[in-house]
């Protein structure tokens, strides 16, 4: 391991469409990939009238957008589906939204997902 880098070996797994996809609904996912490539965790969610609905969480393949991010934060302004990625085991347990476009002080409540 490179000093200062959080290697990702496992991520929180969640799938809202677990029945359709024939997967578990929630659990811990071991992350696989080419040995020399980095691995990350991700979270996707929707904001339906202020209510957070988690879509999926799991492992994400080598992506420079995720490098050295210990926190899972979506920065895109008002996406249809929110997405964030991070490095470090289970780093996708919590996720936040801090839009970069915002001129005024952004507000965000970190979300600790509670599967239904």
């Amino acid at each position: 391991a490179i000093l200062g880098r959080s290697e990702t070996q496992e991520c929180l797994f969640f799938n809202a469409n677990w029945e359709r996809d024939r997967t578990n609904q929630t659990g811990v996912e071991p992350c696989y990939g080419d040995k020399d490539k980095r691995r990350h965790c991700f979270a996707t969610w929707k904001n339906i009238s202020g209510s957070i609905e988690i879509v999926k969480q799991g492992c994400w393949l080598d992506d420079i957008n995720c490098y050295d991010r210990t926190d899972c934060i979506e920065k895109k302004d008002s996406p249809e589906v929110y997405f964030c990625c991070c490095e470090g085991n289970m780093c996708n347990e919590k996720f936040s939204y801090f839009p970069e476009m915002e001129v005024t002080q952004p507000t965000s409540n970190p979300v600790t997902p509670k599967p239904p």
Partner: antibody, heavy 115, light 111 residues
């Protein structure tokens, strides 16, 4: 092993649309991006755009904005690229590739636009 | 984002070393370690050889190496072999906030 299998060759008339599919296997489809690249006969590679396979978020090359639509169906691990208002200079082999590094490629789909 | 600049062709004899350059700007090649190199044989799909400037893709011969200086990335092939004859493209990472771009390609001829 990772595989990306694309749909077969298409012949289209100018002004029509074409939709190319890319079925992924051997990895978790929703764990990366799918990029689309085309190559006109005897020419180089041209990046068209990318889709995040889990969120559906897309980014398109400026040249194709308004004419290309990238979608995916997670339930069948398949990505799609639709190009509309086809012209003769859209004749090319269209490739899908996995991830931001393009580490695995489909076999290519030849789209011929001819009147 | 404008295309990256590569020489149209290079050549070398078996056993020699050759280098292919890929020049961008300070805002793409110069700023990030996200340049990749692809090999394409006629009628085949491209194959990733080097990613992130200098990381060799799994299964790729150690005769292939990548480096970067300023706004120029380079692919070096040592101990040239007949099967290395192909087109080589440089390109950038694409996904999220990063937009992709390729070089025009370089035809490598093994004499």
């Amino acid at each position: 092993q990772v595989q990306l299998v694309q749909s077969g060759a298409e012949v289209k008339k100018p002004g029509a649309s074409v939709k190319v599919s890319c079925k992924a296997s051997g990895y978790t489809f929703t764990s990366s991006y799918i990029n689309w690249v085309r190559q006109a006969p005897g020419q180089g590679l041209e990046w068209m755009g990318t889709i995040n396979a889990v969120s559906g978020s897309t980014s398109y090359a400026q040249k194709f904005q308004g004419r290309v639509t990238m979608t995916r169906d997670e339930s069948i691990s398949t990505a799609y690229m639709e190009l509309s208002r086809l012209r003769s200079d859209d004749t090319a082999v269209y490739y899908c590739a996995r991830g931001g590094w393009f580490d695995y490629w489909g076999q290519g789909t030849l789209v011929t636009v001819s009147s | 984002q404008s295309a990256l600049t590569q020489p149209a062709s290079v050549s070398g004899s078996p056993g020699q070393s050759i280098t292919i350059s890929c020049t961008g700007t300070s805002s793409d090649v110069g700023s990030y370690n996200y340049v990749n190199w692809y090999q394409q044989h006629p009628g085949k799909a491209p194959k990733l050889m080097i990613y992130g400037v200098s990381k060799r893709e799994s299964g790729v011969s150690n005769r292939f190496s990548g480096s970067k200086s300023g706004n120029t990335a380079s692919l070096t092939i040592s101990g040239l072999q007949a099967e290395d004859e192909a087109d080589y493209y440089c390109g950038t990472f694409a996904g999220g906030k990063y937009y992709g771009v390729f070089g025009g390609g370089t035809k490598l001829t093994v004499l």
